[in-house]
Amino acid sequence: ELLDPCGYISPESPVVQLHSNFTAVCVLKEKCMDYFHVNANYIVWKTNHFTIPKEQYTIINRTASSVTFTDIASLNIQLTCNILTFGQLEQNVYGITIISGLPPEKPKNLSCIVNEGKKMRCEWDGGRETHLETNFTLKSEWATHKFADCKAKRDTPTSCTVDYSTVYFVNIEVWVEAENALGKVTSDHINFDPVYKVKPN
């Protein structure tokens, strides 16, 4: 289509760290520039429908304009690239959502118990709020055997009950991985024989 869309913004789906800097680039298509009698100088950037001051723009070339944000403090920013033709008609070119948050902290205080006759359950401290979808995975292994990962549910992100039957009288190694769009961290590993973690009914 000639005008649909008129260009694009790069990156397309950015996730950025809170209080960091971020630059987006809007690139216009040739057909669109021709139709609207415009070039990158006619680009107007907006966040949440408010026009960004021109001082934050950089004209890269005749087809591309960039905008830079410093110290991003909002969790969600609707960013649109628009063109103003004839000084009066504003046409949307493209839009993205900038999602902001924090990388996960290293999980702490990992501990596990085995309720008698049941499977092992571990819990931990997940650290600060990241404002992003953060996945916690409990990993465990015995000697050279890796047990199935235990992925924490969204509603209980700081605990997980393993799927496998507990083995006793051998040491297993357990740790937690926390991952989101901004990074991945691993807790300290703990070693124990599950027999010493049994909690009588």
Partner: antibody
Framework: QVQLVQSGAEVKKPGSSVKVSCKVS????????WSWVRQAPGQGLEWIGR???????NYNPSLKDRVTMTVDTSTSTHYMELSSLRSEDTAVYYC????????????WGQGTLVTVSS | DIQMTQSPSSLSASVGDRVTITCRAS???????LAWYQQKPGKAPKLLIY???SRATGVPSRFSGSGSGTDFTLTISSLQPEDFATYYC????????FGGGTKVEIK
């Protein structure tokens, strides 16, 4: 071949409203802006306004308080409604495609005569 | 808004004549933003020229446009029977405005 087919002639009373339609065939409605232009009997041409499929509009300042343009993408039809009609609104109303560039009218409808008379 | 004034408002000419129609803008218009249309009685206008001198698809080479700033010209190098019509200039640098028209009649 692009074709713009407009609704039929209308006779209206002063103070009332008129809504004229323009159905686009043989080309994509989403590829261009669409304008309305009117011509009073024996007179020149006057641009009314333009619309894009997103609903983005741009009106002639002299008519903006009385004109509303809409688009129905499911039927590839756009509409121009003019309210508070007066006798000087009597004219042939044309829809037109803006191409090959914005502001240029390369395809036109056949015209719709709107007569405002008491 | 930009006013467009055409002259003459009408003219009589014969087949084969060279015809020149002028259009003056009330303020400077970018040469990218000027178009000419032909309209016959009871019909919709037809695009002839845009961007001052670019011919629209299918328009014969006898039609040409020129000019800059506030003064623009449409020339028909050799008038043909089918060219008897009314001609309008139009600027589209702001919201579009048209000239009052020039009627080309048979002498």
């Amino acid at each position: 071949q692009v074709q713009l087919v407009q609704s039929g002639a209308e006779v209206k009373k002063p103070g009332s409203s008129v809504k004229v339609s323009c159905k686009v065939s043989g080309g994509s409605i989403s590829s261009y802006y669409w304008s309305w232009v009117r011509q009073a009997p024996g007179q020149g041409l006057e641009w009314i306004g333009r619309i894009y499929i997103t609903g983005n509009t741009n009106y002639n300042p002299s008519l903006k308080d009385r004109v509303t343009m809409t688009v129905d993408t499911s039927t590839s039809t756009h509409y121009m409604e003019l309210s508070s009609l007066r006798s000087e609104d009597t004219a042939v109303y044309y829809c037109a495609r803006e191409g090959p560039k914005l502001g240029i009218f390369d395809y036109w409808g056949q015209g719709t005569l709107v007569t405002v008379s008491s | 808004d930009i006013q467009m004034t055409q002259s003459p408002s009408s003219l009589s000419a014969s087949v084969g004549d060279r015809v020149t129609i002028t259009c003056r803008a009330s303020q400077s218009v970018s040469s990218s933003y000027l178009a000419w249309y032909q309209q016959k009685p009871g019909k919709a206008p037809k695009l002839l020229i845009y961007g001052t001198e670019s011919r629209a698809t299918g328009v014969p080479s006898r039609f040409s446009g020129s000019g800059s700033g506030t003064d623009f010209t449409l020339t028909i190098s050799s008038l043909q029977p089918e060219d008897f019509a009314t001609y309008y200039c139009q600027q589209y640098g702001g919201y579009p405005t048209f000239g009052g028209g020039t009627k080309v009649e048979i002498k």
